[in-house]
Amino acid sequence: APVLPGEDSKDVAAPHSQPLTSSERIDKHIRYILDGISALRKETCNRSNMCESSKEALAENNLNLPKMAEKDGCFQSGFNEDTCLVKIITGLLEFEVYLEYLQNRFESSEEQARAVQMSTKVLIQFLQKKAKNLDAITTPEPTTNASLLTKLQAQNQWLQDMTTHLILRSFKEFLQSSLRALRQM
């Protein structure tokens, strides 16, 4: 099974090396999740032609996936550490339902899908420790998530393939934006 960062032998600090700082741990965790997403995308691309679909065609899908915008304070123009951290955590919490949806969407990469989901939960915990303004973080309603999950699972095969592809692409871009922003903090 895939190991989370910090669990494999390479991450065990050598006698004279410094243990990872909180920021380094978060950085490493995001890169680990991105590796997992890339592996999952290989399977989706191999079994469907979704990867050839244009971004515009995919965007017509009515999923309300989290996305960074100027107002979120994560871009350098108008950068605001507290606002941005709230956006990253809120966005990751919103992605959780979509990561749950992905759990039954893979055959050969089932463990990888689980690892992405679990390490995202751990990442949220790391970031919550870093955040000063936890009150500003809104957690999605469980009932809303449950009905969204049911709706996604009821789609036809083509739409489910499209949804899977779009979730993975959007999650990748959200994590890349988050990583760029976190390196400014």
């Epitope: 990867c51 971004k55 871009f75 950068f79 871009e173 760029r180």
Partner: antibody, heavy 127, light 111 residues
Framework: EVQLQESGPGLVKPSQTLSLTCTVS??????????WSWIRQPPGKGLEWMGV???????YYKPSLKSRTSISRDTSKNQFSLQLSSVTPEDTAVYYC???????????????????WGKGTLVTVSS | QSALTQPPSMSGTLGKTLTISCNGT?????????VSWYQQLPGTTPKLLIE???TRASGIPDRFSASKSDNTASLTISGLQSEDEATYYC??????????FGGGTHLTVLS
Amino acid sequence: EVQLQESGPGLVKPSQTLSLTCTVSGGSIATSYYAWSWIRQPPGKGLEWMGVIDYDGDTYYKPSLKSRTSISRDTSKNQFSLQLSSVTPEDTAVYYCARAGLGDSYYLGTYYAMDYWGKGTLVTVSS
Amino acid sequence: QSALTQPPSMSGTLGKTLTISCNGTSSDIGSGDYVSWYQQLPGTTPKLLIEGVTTRASGIPDRFSASKSDNTASLTISGLQSEDEATYYCASYRETNNVVFGGGTHLTVLS
């Protein structure tokens, strides 16, 4: 040693679609976290980034060219391609393909550094 | 979408030091360590000199160095040689998900 080679017609008529292919040798475009870019240079002018296709096959384009540009890849042939529609004489340029994605670029989505370039191919748009 | 701003031409004396500037905004040069520099000799393909703001590409002599302050990047060439006569371009990642080049600086080396 990675080598890139552009190919395609040297003359395209206005309003038509310009199609170029970049063949990569000395390394697979489907391995590592590299991305593959297109850059052009009008005669006597500077470099202009057009777009990139990354390791996952995701594409990003220069905003002002986005509506006319498409980049795709064929991993079985180790090639990636550029299509530019509705061309005008202003699209006359030397077109370069290049490899990007050094360091942490994949994780950050920042494909700003291009370490291997093709020799370039001149495309003239004229009737 | 405007390019990064570079002086169109500069001249330097053989053996001396010269610095080329590249001005951008907080959305590109100011957004992180995502700046590269290229050298284009007359009639040839651009060659990567610097990436990650300050890291020299493989095989690039240490006469070439670079730095960044706020929204401005700089390339410094020390001990100018006649073969340094070329056009130099800066490039930067620009939010979100694209890349922008400078207009290029043509360097003339005087003896």
